[in-house]
């Protein structure tokens, strides 16, 4: 009883449970190929408890190993149009700080319109996520076809 | 020590533990673009610890965030048949309550025969997941190419 | 503050907390169409907090429901090179004990050069997981295009 | 409900062609392949191949290829099956057929036959 | 290509009994949880009627006195009990794979 009573009080944050789920917002201007991506029960399903969102990109609050996914899928797209403008390449990765710069998770679209992976790793208070889609295909904002998040899974 | 036997005495299900993970059972007839599913240990691998079936559509038991994912292969497929098949597409979505409708995870085939993804999203006890396969080609009913299934992640 | 010194107090693996992350080390010889995994701090982003490595397999050290996700791209591939080399398949199984030997998450590249999938299954002690690569394109060994991991859910 | 109608019973000379035609009821036409049979009392029932209206593409059963043409205009939701070098061999029923609901080569609906008869 | 052995060539069963019919293919025609064997009835001058898809599958407006078993390389179909409309002549046929092959039929008679 007391261990439930306890774990009531807590707040969940505290609990380590850090999760967010995004939707597309834009792409970036043309030289910048990072998506950026927008979370909040007003924009319908997407949220965001633990990490934030810094300038469109997702900050880390809790160190941890957490689960990340991705879903995107490409506008106007067949498989004509997928291999014509391949390579169209997706990649994941903690962009800041600098330091820690690294790539996390890539994926090429080659005669497909969606990819969608996952992957678990350390993530450490302070990273700042990055997706990266380079070629000429704008992706779908449909929230059921483009989504990015992340799941923290043990300290 | 008092914590974990208050760990060891407390339900599951009081946890917040909720998971599932479905086998394909058939399709509809005709009009109903519904997956039937199935689940339990004498079927093999598949399970329900929490949600329940409801005529082989999944309900939520438990309010939460949820980890959705899905995979399904069609069956005697080749890239040229995905192609010529085309748009063959499957969305997960909450069917019922009408009320909460919605679209929560759609792909298309193209030119591939298995289309496999996962998404984090805000499920309410009630709700009921449908998996729609549009198209005329059959999902595999193979344990290893063709499941579905849930899992709690938080409150 | 008793619950949460006492969460602090436990060591994580009695939480059940395992989890791993694996990176490709390398291919079988000629007729083992297993993947040999490697992990560790001192890899990279790989790790394994609970299950073994076991000549490159994974070994699961405690019994429950299981989150088993890869993803394995093809080396110095196209869709023209992964449809003349079809059938390219990965399959995640157990491969020992032999009792319990099953295949879990089967998947084609068909005209794609990256699978990525995941699964909910239940795994026990002892049980050794294999990936078997068919065919005779070479997988990357990129950590960022492909791994293979498993994280504990629940008992 | 899909109807497939044939064209009429066909006398032909040894060696000479025949094209006979399939037609389709309802707006399905495009989205699943057309297969053509042929029925003969020694040789019971073979598939001869398939289109698919869609994009015009074929498959032929080995022991057909370079025997059948198969053609289909999606305008008039009309598949077409030329048979060449005709032979007594060739005389048969020959059948348009597809599935109803899942594209496989099974066949819920059938055309009513076209007779085609080679005799001198 | 698959080869179909049905069997029997005939049959001759009393109105209201069983009527059993058998369909071997020269290897497998399962895959991915199916068995793609259909049965098919034809009588004098008319095209062949599907009954059953998918070795099992009663097919909309068959009756139910039909039915299918079997998987792999052997499969069944049952008429039971049979009736006067059933005299025709029953194909079995596989979609396993390219070429689909029909089995040589069974003429059912009525005594």
């Known amino acids: 009883q007391r261990f439930a009573q306890a774990q009531q009080q807590l707040p969940l944050e505290s609990l380590g449970w850090d999760v967010a789920e995004l939707q597309l917002n834009h792409t970036g201007p043309q030289q910048d190929p990072r998506l950026y991506w927008q979370g909040g029960p007003a924009l319908g399903r997407s949220f965001l408890h633990g990490p934030e969102l810094d300038k469109g990109q997702l900050r880390i609050h809790r160190d941890g190993i957490y689960m990340v996914h991705i879903q995107v899928t490409l506008a106007i797209c067949s498989s004509t149009t997928a291999s014509r403008h391949h390579p169209t390449t997706l990649a994941v990765g903690i962009c800041s700080p600098a330091s820690r710069s690294i790539s996390l998770l890539r994926l090429s679209f080659h005669q497909g319109c969606t990819i969608a992976s996952q992957r678990l790793t350390p993530l450490a208070r302070g990273d700042t996520l990055c997706t990266n889609l380079t070629g000429t295909l704008l992706p779908s904002r449909n929230t059921d076809e483009t989504f990015f998040g992340v799941q923290w899974v043990r300290p | 020590q008092r914590f974990a036997q208050a760990q060891q005495q407390l339900p599951l299900e009081s946890l917040g533990w909720d998971v599932a993970e479905l086998q394909l059972n058939h399709t509809g007839p005709q009009q109903d673009p519904r997956l039937y599913w199935q689940g339990g240990p004498a079927l093999g691998r598949s399970f329900l610890h929490g949600p329940e079936l409801d005529k082989g559509q999944l309900r939520i038991h438990r309010d939460g965030i949820y980890m959705v994912h899905i995979q399904v292969t069609l069956a005697i497929c080749s890239s040229t048949t995905a192609s010529r098949h085309h748009p063959t597409t499957l969305a997960v979505g909450i069917c019922s309550p009408a009320s909460r409708s919605i679209s929560l995870l759609r792909l298309s085939f193209h030119q591939g025969c298995t289309i496999a993804s996962q998404r984090l999203t805000p499920l309410a006890r009630g709700d009921t997941l449908c998996t729609n396969l549009t198209g005329t080609l059959l999902p595999s009913r193979n344990t290893d190419e063709t499941f579905f299934g849930v899992q709690w992640v938080r409150p | 503050q008793r619950f949460a010194q006492a969460q602090q107090q436990l060591p994580l693996e009695s939480l059940g907390w395992d989890v791993a992350e694996l990176q490709l080390n390398h291919t079988g010889p000629q007729q083992d169409p297993r993947l040999y995994w490697q992990g560790g701090p001192a890899l990279g982003r790989s790790f394994l907090h609970g299950p073994e490595l076991d000549k490159g397999q994974l070994r699961i050290h405690r019994d429950g429901i299981y989150m088993v996700h890869i993803q394995v791209t093809l080396a110095i591939c196209s869709s023209t090179t992964a449809s003349r080399h079809h059938p390219t398949t990965l399959a995640v199984g157990i491969c020992s004990p032999a009792s319990r030997s099953i295949s879990l998450l089967r998947l084609s590249f068909h005209q794609g050069c990256t699978i990525a999938s995941q699964r909910l299954t239940p795994l026990a002690r002892g049980d050794t997981l294999c990936t078997n690569l068919t065919g005779t394109l070479l997988p990357s060994r990129n950590t960022d295009e492909t791994f293979f991991g498993v994280q504990w859910v629940r008992p | 409900q899909v109807q497939l109608k044939q064209s009429g019973a066909e006398l032909v000379k040894p060696g000479a062609s025949v094209k006979m035609s399939c037609k389709a009821s309802?707006?399905?036409?495009?989205?699943?392949?057309m297969h053509w049979l042929k029925q003969t009392p020694g040789q019971g029932l073979e598939w001869i191949g398939a289109?698919?209206?869609?994009?015009?593409?074929?498959s032929y059963n080995q022991n057909f290829k370079g025997k059948a043409t198969l053609t289909a205009d999606k305008s008039s939701s009309t598949a077409y099956m030329q048979l060449n070098s005709l032979t007594s061999e060739d005389s048969a029923v020959y059948y348009c057929?597809?599935?109803?609901?899942?594209?496989?080569?099974?066949?819920?609906?059938w055309g009513q036959g076209t007779l085609v008869t080679v005799s001198a | 290509d698959i080869v179909m052995t049905q069997s029997p060539a005939s049959l001759d069963v009393s109105l209201g009994q069983r009527a059993t019919i058998s369909c071997r293919a020269s290897?497998?025609?399962?895959?991915?949880?199916?068995?793609?064997m259909h049965w098919y009835q034809q009588k004098p001058g008319q095209p062949p009627k599907l009954l059953i898809s998918?070795?099992?599958n009663l097919e909309s407006g068959v009756p139910a006195r039909f039915s299918g078993s079997g998987s792999g390389t052997d499969f069944t179909l049952t008429i039971y009990p049979v009736e006067e409309e059933d005299a025709a002549t029953y194909y079995c046929?596989?979609?396993?794979?390219?070429?689909?092959?029909f089995g040589s039929g069974t003429k059912l008679e009525i005594k």
């Open positions: 057929a597809r599935n109803s609901y899942y594209d496989y080569a099974w066949f819920t609906y």
């Open positions: 309802g707006d399905t036409f495009p989205r699943y392949n």
């Open positions: 289109i698919f209206p869609g994009n015009g593409e074929t």
């Open positions: 290897k497998s025609v399962s895959s991915s949880g199916y068995s793609f």
């Open positions: 998918l070795a099992s």
């Open positions: 046929q596989h979609s396993r794979e390219f070429p689909p092959t």
